[in-house]
């Protein structure tokens, strides 16, 4: 297993609709064709997997049907969006990138993006 640098923003504020987006960029040492991206949440010293997707370079990210994440890729950048967030979901969201194929296997873990979520009052006759 070889190490790889992963960069992500330090702080993101979720929208009033509970949507947060951030870019996860990795320094690919080679020409990977298959990449796996995992979003981990760290809060109260507990780490849980939020979502994960494997994609072939040049193709769309494919998350599970019931995933709360969506994303797109462009070169060595992955644009991740998490939806349905509320105040209790505030925490550090860590981007983990694995270059699965071809060998050698590379692993990179970002420092995390602190996502802040506020529960707003709904506006009259609207969805926030």
């Amino acid at each position: 297993c070889k190490a790889m640098h992963v960069a992500q923003p330090a702080v993101v504020l979720a929208s009033s609709r509970g949507i947060a987006s951030f870019v996860c960029e990795y320094a690919s040492p080679g020409k990977a064709t298959e990449v796996r991206v995992t979003v981990l949440r760290q809060a109260d010293s507990q780490v849980t997997e939020v979502c994960a997707a494997t994609y072939m370079m040049g193709n769309e990210l494919t998350f599970l049907d019931d995933s709360i994440c969506t994303g797109t890729s462009s070169g060595n950048q992955v644009n991740l969006t998490i939806q349905g967030l509320r105040a209790m979901d505030t925490g550090l969201y860590i981007c983990k990138v694995e270059l699965m194929y071809p060998p050698p296997y590379y692993l990179g873990i970002g420092n995390g993006t602190q996502i802040y979520v506020i529960d707003p009052e709904p506006c009259p006759d609207s969805d926030f």
């Epitope: 019931d66 709360i68 998490i82 349905g84 105040a87 209790m88």
Partner: antibody, heavy 123, light 107 residues
Framework: QVQLVQSGAEVKKPGASVKVSCKAS????????IHWVRQAPGQGLEWMGI????????ISAQKFQGRVTMTSDTSTSTVSMELSSLRSDDTAVYYC????????????????WGQGTLVTVSS | DIQLTQSPSSLSASVGDRVTITCRVS??????LNWYRQKPGEIPKLLIY???SLQSGVPSRFSGSGSGTDFTLTISSLQPEDIATYYC?????????FGQGTKLEIK
């Protein structure tokens, strides 16, 4: 095991207030939102509001704003819902239900409900 | 206001039938939708969450699909105990509105 136990049935007069409580056990009370839902006799489900027990922040449906007050007591793992200025059409069964943060992916929203509290408003 | 419209409002089907109930939402809610079954005199029971995830302990004859604004609950083979009213609910954000319900009866 996870339980939400609600207070007993109430009979109130129009214009009065009612307070329904929901005591949680079997899970970390401050890690889940609690919703209030009501159901009038023979009618559908109606969402009333949500409370974050850890901070006490609330959101209520527009229809109930100004009339509903939701509170939490972390020392007893209890949330309460008070509805004021009662009318006959507030006669309903009132339910509480828990709801995890969405990133708690192993738990489903509204997976556990209280047994319901019948509130009858009659002169 | 955000509207959830279920169709049909009532339906009658035979044991073993495939039954489909639809829920249309007035705004895009991605996949954040629940389905419930409520038998007479009982509390609502969660069947499906996030549009297609089967809640633990729920029979596999129940399935959900859809995203955005159009969702479907399917019972692959109707059983006598499925006599109930079915509700959809958006869990995207407040208000966590319910559909008006679909009353299912056995022929």
């Amino acid at each position: 095991q996870v339980q939400l136990v609600q207070s007993g049935a109430e009979v109130k007069k129009p214009g009065a207030s009612v307070k329904v409580s929901c005591k949680a056990s079997g899970f970390t009370f401050t890690s889940y939102y609690i919703h209030w839902v009501r159901q009038a006799p023979g009618q559908g489900l109606e969402w009333m509001g949500i409370i974050n027990p850890s901070g006490g922040s609330t959101i209520s449906a527009q229809k109930f704003q100004g009339r509903v007050t939701m509170t939490s007591d972390t020392s007893t793992s209890t949330v309460s819902m008070e509805l004021s200025s009662l009318r006959s059409d507030d006669t309903a069964v009132y339910y509480c239900a828990r709801d995890p943060p969405i990133t708690m992916v192993r738990d489903a929203p509204f997976d556990y409900w209280g047994q319901g509290t019948l509130v009858t408003v009659s002169s | 206001d955000i509207q959830l419209t279920q169709s049909p409002s009532s339906l009658s089907a035979s044991v073993g039938d495939r039954v489909t109930i639809t829920c249309r939402v007035s705004q895009d809610i991605s996949r954040l939708l629940n389905w419930y079954r409520q038998k007479p005199g009982e509390i609502p029971k969660l069947l499906i969450y996030r549009a297609s995830s089967l809640q633990s302990g729920v029979p596999s004859r129940f399935s959900g699909s859809g995203s955005g604004t159009d969702f479907t609950l399917t019972i692959s083979s109707l059983q006598p105990e499925d006599i109930a009213t079915y509700y959809c609910q958006r869990t995207y954000s407040a208000p966590y509105t319910f559909g008006q319900g679909t009353k299912l009866e056995i022929k």
